[in-house]
């Protein structure tokens, strides 16, 4: 007869191993005991249980509560067990002794293989703002055995670096992606996308990127000039800029306080019916956390009457 | 036919020692581990040492530890419990009995003496 | 330790009375139990071994079963020969332990 087992056992943490020890005997042959041992290079082998054909399963005090037979139906040949719960301490050599009559002993050796998962983690970079250099924008990390592969998945050109960490049962993997922060990465998407043989599928932890960043601000509403005459309604002008964070806006007249009656709503300033005294020197200032900007417009309210007497003299003059 | 005969019994004083034998005859005693068992008057079995074949590893109920020492003398087919600071709960007739099978879990007493019995009394 | 609780503690019986003694472990003890039988100024005698394993020389009428934490002794047909003491013992684990024994009385 001979035994039949697996080289290689692979099992995720927290998962049932199945520890596979068949006899696969001649007619007649009978299986009295099977004795299941840990038996690690340089140490001693430390019994885990005894399938005896009578007794039943014996579990030594250390593995009590952990080891099983499978489930029925049973063969009388099979020595199998179930380590339950496997945990990465289990991982190491495992040795079946199956004792038989009248052929004898045998025995069999095999390697359990713990898979444990990683529980990645992804830790954004120090702010990114438009105008630095080649900046870190995340650094993803995953501790795993064996050692995970971390990779990045985004739209966004940069650069990639990793490290590995050994420690005695697993190995931690960072990776971090660099870039140059411009404003058109802003809610762009970059995704640690870590793989391992004990997972199901990737896992994937996606960060938005922020690029903090102010444009230039202009005003519009002075386009038509002649637009802005004494009497007119529904006067404004607009102040355009755009930023990360969303930037704020405030009107100022640089040469005095704003006349009475005009309206500051955000980016825009509404005027009451013009008169010459709206005319001047008006300010918007943009500004966030990263940035502010100035635009300043001249505003010069033409008077019909002057105007028409103008051209008249001019008519008279030709 | 396996046969186990206790002797060293008798009568001592709460403190006192007393050395117990068993002597084995018709069958390979040395293949086999070998236990005592003892019974207090009128009360059920209570196991009290065990020892390998090879006199590896004894073990003890508690209620004996660090005062019993059990031994075999291979050569003479002969099991012995060296009993000390005796109590009077330690009266009891005591049984040697041998294991079926040489391990440390796992046995069935399958042959018995017929008993010492040890009575501590002041 | 394991606690081997057997019931009842006595019972009476006639001859020809299938008797049935039952024995519970305090944890798994998948099979390893032993009954004996014990009459008075008497060694134990080995009955049943692997909780349904009869031993050499003992009587057919005596039969064991059980496994993990729950065990039975039946004597099919009393004998007068079989009032006795009977007392099972599991050896899982160190301490071997035993029940308290169950007495078998002419009724």
């Known amino acids: 007869g001979e035994l039949e087992t697996s080289d290689v056992v692979t099992v995720v943490l927290g998962q049932d191993a199945k520890l596979p020890c068949f006899y696969r005997g001649d007619s007649g042959e009978q299986v009295g005991q099977v004795a299941w041992a840990r038996v690690d290079a340089g140490e001693g082998a430390q019994e885990l249980a005894l399938l005896h054909s009578k007794y039943g399963l014996h579990v030594s005090p250390a593995y009590e509560g952990r080891v099983e037979q499978p489930p029925p139906p049973r063969n009388p040949l099979d020595g199998s067990v179930l380590l339950r719960n496997a945990v990465q301490a289990d991982e190491g050599e495992y040795e079946c002794r199956v004792s038989t009559f009248p052929a004898g002993s045998f025995q069999a050796r095999l390697r359990l293989r713990v898979l444990v998962p990683p529980l990645p983690s992804l830790n954004p970079g120090p702010a990114l703002e438009e105008g630095q250099g080649l900046t870190l924008a995340a650094s993803c990390t995953a501790e795993g055995s064996p050692a995970p592969s971390v990779t990045w998945d985004t739209e966004v050109k940069g650069t990639t670096s990793s490290r590995s960490f050994k420690h005695s049962r697993s190995a931690a993997v960072t990776s971090e992606f660099h870039l140059v922060p411009s404003r058109s990465m802003n809610g762009q998407p970059l995704t640690c996308v870590v793989s391992h043989p004990g997972l199901l599928q990737d896992q994937r932890i996606t960060h938005i990127l922020h690029v903090s960043f102010l444009a230039e601000a202009s005003v519009r509403g002075l386009e038509d000039q002649n637009l802005w005459h004494i009497g007119r309604e529904g006067a404004m002008l607009k102040c355009l800029s755009e930023g990360q964070p969303p930037p704020s806006y405030n009107w100022t007249r640089l040469d005095g306080p704003l006349p009475s009656g005009v309206r500051v709503d955000g980016d825009t300033l509404g005027f009451p019916p013009l008169t010459t005294e709206h005319s001047g020197i008006y300010v918007c200032h943009v500004s966030n956390e990263f940035s502010s900007r100035d635009s300043q417009v001249t505003v010069d309210v033409l008077d019909p009457q002057e105007d028409s007497g103008k051209q008249v003299d001019l008519v008279s003059a030709s | 036919e396996v046969q186990l005969v206790e002797s060293g019994g008798g009568l001592v004083q709460p403190g006192g020692s007393l050395r117990l034998s068993c002597a084995a005859s018709?069958?390979?005693?040395?293949?086999?581990?070998m236990s005592w068992v003892r019974q207090a008057p009128g009360k059920g079995l209570e196991w009290v040492s065990r020892?390998?074949?090879?006199?590896?590893?004894?073990s003890y109920a508690d209620s004996v530890k660090g005062r019993f020492t059990i031994s075999r003398d291979n050569s003479k087919n002969t099991l012995y419990l060296q009993m000390n600071s005796l109590r009077a709960e330690d009266t009891a007739v005591y049984y040697c009995?041998?294991?079926?099978?040489?391990?440390?879990?796992?046995?069935?007493?399958?042959?018995w003496g017929q008993g010492t019995l040890v009575t501590v009394s002041s | 330790d394991i606690q081997m609780t057997q019931s009842p503690s006595s019972l009476s019986a006639s001859v020809g009375d299938r008797v049935t003694i039952t024995c519970r472990a305090s944890?798994?003890?998948?099979?390893?139990l032993a009954w004996y039988q014990q009459k008075p100024g008497k060694a134990p005698k080995l009955l049943i071994y692997?909780?349904?394993s009869l031993q050499s020389g003992v009587p057919s009428r005596f039969s064991g079963s059980g496994s993990g934490t729950d065990f039975t002794l039946t004597i099919s047909s009393l004998q007068p020969e079989d009032f006795a003491t009977y007392y099972c013992?599991?050896?899982?684990?160190?301490?071997?332990?035993f029940g308290q024994g169950t007495k078998v009385e002419i009724k």
């Open positions: 009995a041998r294991q079926t099978e040489d391990r440390s879990y796992g046995y069935d007493l399958d042959y």
């Open positions: 018709g069958d390979s005693f040395t293949s086999y581990a």
């Open positions: 020892i390998s074949a090879d006199s590896a590893s004894p």
């Open positions: 944890q798994g003890i998948s099979s390893y």
């Open positions: 692997a909780a349904s």
């Open positions: 013992q599991q050896h899982y684990t160190t301490p071997p332990t």
